[in-house]
């Protein structure tokens, strides 16, 4: 399906509005430090050029690839060397190496100021004054902070963002209407970004086969009535979409995602009975809805898998002669029967099955060797089940904040070299698994919990990759994508760690803590907790609890004091001394 001009093709397919939005996202994800105005200028130039190509596909440069066009445009930025340093060297390269170079310089933790939400009236005025600029700025700010955000999904978020302002800026109580909507978009956006980051990591670090295996398992759970050929087609198409988005090919990605949604809706009878409502929605909502659709009911009359994959004496012949189809079919059949398992567990089972066949099909009596392969699955299934049971009990006992604290201590002891902000961020997110998943019945707990933990641990992995400090983190992150969580769970206290020198400044607090939101105050306390553990990794739970309780009382007391700053200074010194004594520092 070759087109004379790729840029004209995508402009026509996507329409001007989506074209401009996607180019802005692409540029902001590549050049994360560039000012908004510079990006808008570049986008406008690209859009004008695209229009000339739509008018005449044979016009000069219209036959160039999108990477060439976009890369050339990015390389016109005057301050590239001063702002981005060695990233400027990318511009000396030819495509496709230039694009690969830009991709390698994407920063998961860019040094950007935190987004501060203005007053509602200020936001509404800005929205009414220039709606287009207001929405572009939203795309720009999210894209530059989340360089792997799933671009077509960001268009959906922007549509909801616009709808929130359109509705709430006319409301009697603007703040009551708008703020909860913005909070929801922020939280969903962070979750969406993290989920997509895992997909990109899967593709980039472990390859297409790993991503396809994940997709087979997930789609088979979601569409258990769809036959293998249908699931395989969806997996191939979905892999193409995510490969494009993760590779910075956002126009192709959005276009192909729309085609995939169209195909799914045209063939929903052979895919899932749950798609009807999704398929009645407009494009962006439709694609989002399909991505989140609940699992269809399992078909009736599914026979045991043992007959074909264990009991048959021809397993090795089938495996040898049609490896990928045979293993793919195994994963598909197992996953559609087990919506109660996490995707990563299903992939572990498939890997165990494959390893067993590799070993047994070379043995003297293959059938005798692989006859008990399903027995090997039992401990693999029980391990996450037990872990989730124990942690949900702990969560129900402690509540979210204290459960997060328990995880903070646990993970700081495992990998104390990791930076405190990363440990706080990751442990807080790990702790959210409780309120997210423990409310579910048994049959939904594991897929909710373990697949969510995979997303969170990937955040740790990508942040750690930027500045590696722990061999243990590197090992767990790189050895096996599906065994990351068991790898981290299995880590004990790092006995090689030399405790951090005590620094009183780390434990000095000021009156500004009193004006922080509850969430920000929690983060301050949790930051102190991580630092405590780094100073005293052998501290017991009881010791840490006593210090944290004293700390909470100290903050509460000083925030009620008339002279807050004096209170923090004087009582703070006492608290540090008492804590040192309690912990034997």
């Amino acid at each position: 399906d070759a087109h004379k001009s790729e840029v004209a093709h995508r402009f026509k397919d996507l329409g001007e509005e989506n074209f401009k939005a996607l180019v802005l996202i692409a540029f902001a994800q590549y050049l994360q430090q560039c000012p908004f105005e510079d990006h808008v200028k570049l986008v406008n130039e690209v859009t004008e050029f695209a229009k000339t190509c739509v008018a005449d596909e044979s016009a000069e440069n219209c036959d160039k690839s999108l990477h060439t066009l976009f890369g050339d445009k990015l390389c016109t930025v005057a301050t590239l060397r001063e702002t981005y340093g060695e990233m400027a060297d990318c511009c000396a390269k030819q495509e496709p190496e230039r694009n690969e170079c830009f991709l390698q310089h994407k920063d998961d933790n860019p040094n950007l100021p935190r987004l501060v939400r203005p007053e509602v009236d200020v936001m509404c005025t800005a929205f009414h004054d220039n709606e287009e600029t207001f929405l572009k700025k939203y795309l720009y700010e999210i894209a530059r902070r989340h360089p792997y955000f799933y671009a077509p999904e960001l268009l959906f978020f922007a549509k909801r963002y616009k709808a929130a302002f359109t509705e709430c800026c006319q409301a009697a109580d603007k703040a009551a209407c708008l703020l909860p909507k913005l909070d929801e978009l922020r939280d969903e956006g962070k979750a969406s970004s993290a989920k997509q980051r895992l997909k990109c990591a899967s593709l980039q670090k472990f390859g297409e086969r790993a991503f396809k295996a994940w997709a087979v398992a997930r789609l088979s759970q979601r569409f258990p009535k769809a036959e293998f050929a249908e699931v395989s087609k969806l997996v191939t198409d979905l892999t193409k979409v995510h490969t494009e988005c993760c590779h910075g090919d956002l126009l192709e990605c959005a276009d192909d995602r729309a085609d995939l949604a169209k195909y799914i809706c045209e063939n929903q009878d052979s895919i899932s009975s749950k798609l009807k409502e999704c398929c009645e929605k407009p494009l962006l909502e439709k694609s989002h809805c399909i991505a989140e659709v609940e699992n269809d009911e399992m078909p009736a009359d599914l026979p045991s898998l043992a007959a074909d994959f264990v009991e048959s004496k021809d397993v090795c012949k089938n495996y040898a002669e049609a490896k990928d189809v045979f293993l793919g079919m195994f994963l598909y059949e197992y996953a559609r029967r087990h919506p109660d398992y996490s995707v990563v567990l299903l992939l572990r089972l498939a890997k165990t099955y494959e390893t067993t066949l590799e070993k047994c099909c070379a043995a003297a009596d293959p059938h005798e060797c692989y006859a008990k392969v399903f027995d090997e699955f039992k401990p693999l299934v029980e391990e996450p089940q037990n872990l989730i049971k124990q942690n949900c009990e702990l969560f129900e006992q402690l509540g979210e904040y204290k459960f997060q604290n328990a995880l903070l201590v646990r993970y700081t002891k495992k990998v104390p070299q990791v930076s405190t902000p990363t440990l706080v961020e990751v442990s807080r997110n790990l702790g959210k698994v409780g309120s997210k998943c423990c409310k579910h019945p048994e049959a939904k707990r594991m897929p909710c919990a373990e697949d969510y933990l995979s997303v969170v641990l990937n955040q740790l992995c990508v942040l750690h990759e930027k500045t590696p400090v722990s061999d243990r983190v590197t090992k767990c992150c790189t050895e096996s994508l599906v065994n990351r969580r068991p790898c981290f769970s299995a880590l004990e206290v790092d006995e090689t760690y030399v405790p951090k020198e005590f620094n009183a400044e780390t434990f000095t607090f000021h009156a500004d803590i009193c004006t922080l939101s509850e969430k920000e105050r929690q983060i301050k306390k949790q930051t102190a907790l991580v630092e405590l553990v780094k100073h005293k990794p052998k501290a017991t739970k009881e010791q840490l609890k006593a210090v944290m309780d004293d700390f909470a009382a100290f903050v509460e007391k000083c925030c009620k004091a008339d002279d807050k700053e004096t209170c923090f200074a004087e009582e703070g010194k006492k608290l540090v001394a008492a804590s040192q004594a309690a912990l034997g520092l």
């Epitope: 050929a229 007959a307 021809d314 089938n318 189809v325």
Partner: antibody, heavy 120, light 107 residues
Framework: EVQLVESGGGLVQPGGSLRLSCAAS????????MNWVRQAPGKGLEWIGH???????YYATWAKGRFTISRDNSKNTVYLQMNSLRAEDTAVYFC??????????????WGQGTLVTVSS | FELTQSPSSLSASVGDRVTITCQAS??????LAWYQQKPGQPPKLLIY???DLTSGVPSRFSGSGSGTDFTLTISSLQPEDFATYYC??????????FGTGTKLTVL
């Protein structure tokens, strides 16, 4: 509608050849092991062989050599090539879908069958 | 392997409880199916994996057994149940075998 339709049966002389077709509709044949089963007049069911999702064919011992199963996924059709036909090959030939891609059973979906008569 | 069904024919009345057995020449675990066939029609799957009832099949049909010995039971015969019944063993290899058949007729 999910169904299987056999065709290609008819009268053939001893020693002759015949190719039966089984056209699938409402599902993709490549996802399943597709079987051929025959039933001589007034007799029981006799499995001939199947072709699985890995395109590997298996046959009953008695069918090896004379019978060949193949498929064309683009046409969503499976075939049974029968050579050196004998009078005892006279039967209704059924096409049946396995439960999965590598399944030898059970068979929930069957065609209506096509009659093959071997006679001079 | 071979499957032997007994009896080869059976006469019974509406309302009767009927039992058909199927014996395998070697263990096939629970990989046995039961089919019902009426003249001029293809077989219809009743039971799979020895005891699992196919959706849409009346609950008066039940299956049991494992290893080498299997049973199909019709708890209370209905007029539409008069037909020929076959067992099928599968899963031990990529081949499959049908039983010899049991013809159930009206007494």
């Amino acid at each position: 509608e999910v169904q299987l339709v056999e065709s290609g049966g008819g009268l053939v002389q001893p020693g002759g050849s015949l190719r039966l077709s089984c056209a699938a509709s409402g599902f993709s044949l490549s996802s399943y092991a597709m079987n051929w089963v025959r039933q001589a007049p007034g007799k029981g069911l006799e499995w001939i062989g199947h072709i699985n999702a890995g395109d590997i064919a298996y046959y009953a011992t008695w069918a090896k050599g004379r019978f060949t199963i193949s498929r064309d996924n683009s046409k969503n059709t499976v075939y049974l090539q029968m050579n050196s036909l004998r009078a005892e090959d006279t039967a209704v030939y059924f096409c049946a879908r396995g439960a999965g891609g590598f399944s030898t059973g059970p068979f929930k979906l069957w065609g209506q069958g096509t009659l093959v008569t071997v006679s001079s | 392997f071979e499957l032997t069904q007994s009896p080869s024919s059976l006469s019974a009345s509406v309302g009767d409880r009927v039992t058909i057995t199927c014996q395998a020449s070697e263990s096939i675990n629970s990989r046995l199916a039961w089919y019902q066939q009426k003249p001029g029609q293809p077989p219809k799957l009743l039971i799979y994996d020895a005891s699992d009832l196919t959706s849409g099949v009346p609950s008066r049909f039940s299956g049991s057994g494992s290893g080498t010995d299997f049973t199909l039971t019709i708890s209370s015969l209905q007029p539409e149940d008069f037909a020929t019944y076959y067992c099928q063993g599968y899963g031990g290899s990529s081949t499959t075998t049908f039983g010899t058949g049991t013809k159930l007729t009206v007494l």
